[in-house]
């Protein structure tokens, strides 16, 4: 469909005009500007950047640009009492200490306010004890240790390698296992790609590089002291003992040079198999404790970080819609970084900046979008998605009534191999159609579409000739919009080749070495991948805000619902005897999915045929599309996770970054064979099937003819 649909539009003001206005050189310039000093949440530097962005968005032509501030719980190291880990001998003398900071990259030696590596929200403490190596500290790793190897982590300090799952899940698992401290480290197996030099000569992690990050288990709560409500001037704050998601044991991250010193002395059990071995020249023994001559030595943690209520600032820009100003399409990404933010977040923020500039240019020429576009520069994402969540809590009533879509814009790149998209099924067709119209930036695909290179490099596992699109998980600012409010959401970035590069994320993630030079020298010298991501993100926003009929296809939801129902049924069928004993049936769910499929098909037929010149009918059909995602929200939320309310998708209980389908049923079935009361456990499975079936049926009915 053409997008030349808003009022007082001229023919050149279409999607093409918007896309043509996006320039790689501008993105490069903005990235440079955003990465010269650290912009840690809660600091003066990040407040100044917020004001700069506010001023520039106004200059670009947005109708209004406001700062929205909140006072939230943040965490910082003690400047005079640094965090570190020691090996102590039997007399308590420190015979080895981990480094207190990362060696600064060339050209940044005199930059002040580089926060040393720390695990945000770690409690203070100085535990000492024997070390146990717990691999990635995943649920299955602790199962291996406790159930198979019969190794007890109670009272031990555990050392876990970063990767595979969100670090907060690692800490939660360690706590549940009874550990009294956690050391996180980056293993070269996960953060050093073979054949590439370490920074500054390449994009690999040097031995002194360390990944920062929060270790919360918020489950969508936002500010730990004000769950469910905005952290405004009159907020009632919980006491720290009642705060949501804070870890209870000290945690600290280190690099692989320091990790080598700890791991090389490990005794106890050999690693259970090859999947527990990294790339250091150490045996990867599990422990507990050190070997032989070192068996009397212990590990001691020294953690002195403090939690402080601190003011944060979101920047919210508005481009008012000409026809439906009460319908919001939101483009948001965060501004705060751990240090320079060369990739995370400023490669995304620079793209948002250029998208705003392009929209502003069109607006100055007399164009307006059909619907209102909101642009957001979120604060304190690194501390638990706090800025976006507090703003959404403050504006939840507006958002749930008016929110059409949310497009996320964190890091634009995590590699330079191909496109990566995670989104609601409602957006599949939008993404497919858009990428067919965009040029591929990939070598060897000159003159070919982005869709073609993406499909070739990242094929769908189910449908031939189509690209892979993943489920939304969490770990980014779309969480509150999608998982809590049920607003259709999507994200896009350029990624690595997951086939050949098995390291987790990108090697320099959240380290001091994530600089402008990292991007300009090694990832995207021509900024062509950034430009492509700007075209995808901006193009999605343009279509969502401007097309007469919302570019959502409800039939794609029907397809995935059937796939997810099949998947969860097959998981349950691993227990055929229990399903029989407790009369567990998925008939209601499959029936609801069938009904959804039929009703979605009929709705799509009506969508082709209705009179688009009738504004009332048009609005009615669009509202049915807009509210479909909302219909998957259960107001009661998932068990023990009240802010994860989407019945079809939630962040995995074992890895916040990953999405799980039918999460209520999945969690009820997980490890069910170990439950003390099987009757109760299978009763909960039945209840979750009931909730899922009801929700799918209820969502289907929102697509039925209204009368």
């Amino acid at each position: 469909k053409s997008s030349n649909e808003a009022t007082n539009i001229t023919p050149k003001h279409n999607m093409k005009a918007f896309l043509d206005e996006l320039k790689a050189e501008n993105i490069k310039k903005f990235l440079y500007n955003f990465t010269q000093i650290p912009h840690l949440a809660g600091t003066e530097q990040n407040f100044q950047l917020a004001k700069q962005i506010q001023s520039q968005w106004k200059e670009f032509g947005l109708d209004s640009v406001e700062l929205a501030h909140y006072d939230v719980l943040l965490s910082y190291p003690n400047k005079t009492h640094p965090n570190y880990i020691s090996i102590i001998n039997e007399d308590g003398n420190e015979i080895f200490n981990t480094s207190l900071f990362e060696p600064p990259p060339p050209g940044y030696e005199n930059v002040s306010d580089i926060v040393p590596p720390f695990s945000a929200f770690s409690p203070q403490g100085m535990p000492e004890g024997d070390l146990v190596y717990v691999n990635y500290a995943r649920t299955e790793d602790f199962f291996k240790l406790e159930r198979d190897m019969k190794i007890n982590c109670s009272g031990k300090i555990v050392i876990a390698r970063y990767g595979k799952v969100f670090r907060g899940n690692k800490v939660k698992n360690a706590q549940l296992a009874g550990a009294k401290g956690v050391i996180l480290y980056s293993d070269p197996a996960d953060y050093f790609a073979p054949g590439v030099k370490s920074y500054p000569d390449g994009w690999n992690l040097p031995g002194g590089g360390v990944q920062r990050g929060n270790i919360l288990n918020l489950n969508g709560a936002g500010d730990p002291l004000t769950p469910g409500y905005p952290a405004n001037e009159y907020a009632y704050r919980r006491g720290i003992a009642e705060a949501v998601g804070l870890p209870s044991i000290p945690v600290h991250p280190i690099g692989y040079y320091d990790a080598q010193k700890l791991l090389e002395k490990m005794g106890g059990s050999a690693p259970p198999d090859s999947s527990w071995r990294g790339s250091l020249k150490v045996p990867y023994n599990v422990g507990p404790g050190f070997t032989g001559n070192f068996s009397t030595q212990k590990v001691k943690m020294h953690i002195h970080s403090t939690n402080e209520v601190t003011r944060i600032y979101n920047v919210i820009g508005t481009l008012r819609g000409a026809v439906e100003p009460d319908r919001y399409v939101i483009l948001g990404g965060h501004r705060d970084s751990w240090v320079f933010g060369g990739i995370d977040p400023q490669s995304g923020a620079a793209v948002v900046h250029e998208i705003v500039r392009s929209f502003g240019t069109l607006k100055k020429e007399g164009w307006r979008p059909r619907r209102t576009i909101l642009f957001a520069s979120w604060d304190a994402e690194e501390f638990g998605l706090l800025g976006s969540t507090e703003w959404a809590e403050e504006n939840s009533r507006l958002l749930q009534e008016r929110g059409v879509a949310y497009i996320n814009a964190d890091s634009s790149i995590e590699g330079n191999y191909t496109l990566r998209v995670d989104c609601t099924p409602l957006m599949y067709s939008l993404v497919h159609n858009l990428t067919k119209e965009l040029k591929s930036p990939d070598e060897g695909f000159e003159g070919k579409s982005l869709y073609e290179s993406w499909t070739k490099k990242s094929p769908s596992p189910e449908f031939s000739g189509m690209p892979r699109i993943s489920k939304l998980g969490s770990g980014n600012d779309f969480e509150v919009f999608f998982q809590r409010l049920g607003i259709a959401s999507g994200r896009a970035r350029y990624t690595k080749n997951w086939e050949t590069n098995k390291f987790s994320g990108y090697p320099l993630y959240h380290s001091v070495y994530e600089t402008y030079e990292l991007v300009e020298k090694f990832y995207d010298p021509m900024f062509k991948y950034h430009l492509t991501v700007a075209q995808v993100r901006g193009g999605m926003v343009f279509e969502l805000a401007n097309s007469i009929v919302l570019p959502f296809d409800c039939r794609d939801y029907a397809v995935v619902l059937r796939k997810y129902a099949d998947k969860i049924y097959s998981i349950s069928m691993k227990h055929p005897q229990e399903m029989k004993t407790y009369s567990v049936s998925f008939d209601s769910l499959f029936s609801a999915v069938k009904n959804f499929t039929e009703i979605a098909s009929k709705f799509s037929e009506r969508l082709q045929d209705f009179d688009k010149s009738n504004p009332i009918v048009l609005r009615m059909m669009n509202d049915q599309l807009m509210f479909l995602e909302r219909a998957f929200i259960d107001p009661l939320g998932l068990p023990d996770r009240p802010f994860y309310r989407h019945v079809i998708y939630a962040p995995s209980s074992h890895n916040k970054y990953a999405g799980e389908s039918f999460p209520g049923i999945y969690d009820a079935l997980f490890d069910i064979e170990s439950k003390v009361d099987p009757s109760k456990a299978w009763g909960e499975v039945k209840r979750q099937i009931y909730v899922a079936a009801f929700t799918v049926q209820a969502a289907a009915e929102t697509l039925s003819e209204v009368a």
Partner: antibody, heavy 115, light 107 residues
Framework: EVQLVQSGAEVKKPGASVKVSCKTS????????IHWVRQAPGQSLEWMGN????????TYNQKFQGRVTITVDKSTSTAYMELSSLRSEDTAVYYC????????WGQGTLVTVSS | DIVMTQSPDSLAVSLGERATLSCRAS??????VDWYQQKPDQSPKLLIY???TRHTGVPDRFTGSGSGTDFTLTISSLQAEDVAVYFC?????????FGAGTKVEIK
């Protein structure tokens, strides 16, 4: 009740390969390491290698490296050990054992290598 | 490879008497030692893991002790059904290795 049931005795010629199966029941298959051990007549036990059924991660005794392959089929909760390039000194009883500490053992499979 | 040396090769003990079996590792293995019992024409059975923890269902007359390089399995009061070969094994480093075994008989 945990059970490991191995395939029957085999007679092989030198240079051939043998694949021994180990069907498990009574526990969650992916949770326990599977080891393979052999015992030559009147001799001690010799560890050959192991596998993590959850992710297929293996470790082999260097002595057998290149000759032994351990695999699993999660759908049937079965582990397999294949030994190639057989020689007469490979004549032994081959055991699978479940659990990192070799908690539960199969009944053993006699493999005779003879020309 | 770590060598596990068991002594004695065989041991004859009267019913009701104590039997003490030794196992020495060629290098420090901490407490990463397990003990197995193998009766004639049967598969081995796990008795003791982590040097001193009895496996489920193992009678309390079986006791394991030791750490580092020296380990002991004690049968406090030998019963007729305890006649078997007993193997120690280290799980501290690859390849996992077994001792040659100690044969326990009734005197």
């Amino acid at each position: 009740e945990v059970q490991l049931v191995q395939s029957g005795a085999e007679v092989k010629k030198p240079g051939a390969s043998v694949k021994v199966s180990c069907k498990t029941s009574g526990y969650t298959f992916t949770e326990y390491t599977i080891h393979w051990v052999r015992q030559a007549p009147g001799q001690s036990l010799e560890w050959m290698g192991n596998i993590n059924p959850n992710n297929g991660g293996t470790t082999y005794n260097q002595k057998f490296q290149g000759r032994v392959t351990i695999t699993v089929d999660k759908s049937t909760s079965t582990a397999y050990m294949e030994l190639s390039s057989l020689r007469s000194e490979d004549t032994a009883v081959y055991y699978c054992a479940a659990g990192w500490n070799f908690d539960y053992w199969g009944q053993g499979t006699l493999v005779t290598v003879s020309s | 490879d770590i060598v596990m040396t068991q002594s004695p090769d065989s041991l004859a003990v009267s019913l009701g008497e104590r039997a003490t079996l030794s196992c020495r590792a060629s290098q420090d293995v901490g407490t990463a030692v397990d003990w197995y019992q193998q009766k004639p024409d049967q598969s081995p059975k796990l008795l003791i893991y982590w040097a001193s923890t009895r496996h489920t269902g193992v009678p309390d007359r079986f006791t394991g002790s030791g750490s580092g390089t020296d380990f002991t399995l004690t049968i406090s009061s030998l019963q007729a059904e305890d006649v078997a070969v007993y193997f120690c094994q280290q799980i501290n480093s690859y390849p996992l290795t077994f001792g040659a075994g100690t044969k326990v008989e009734i005197k």
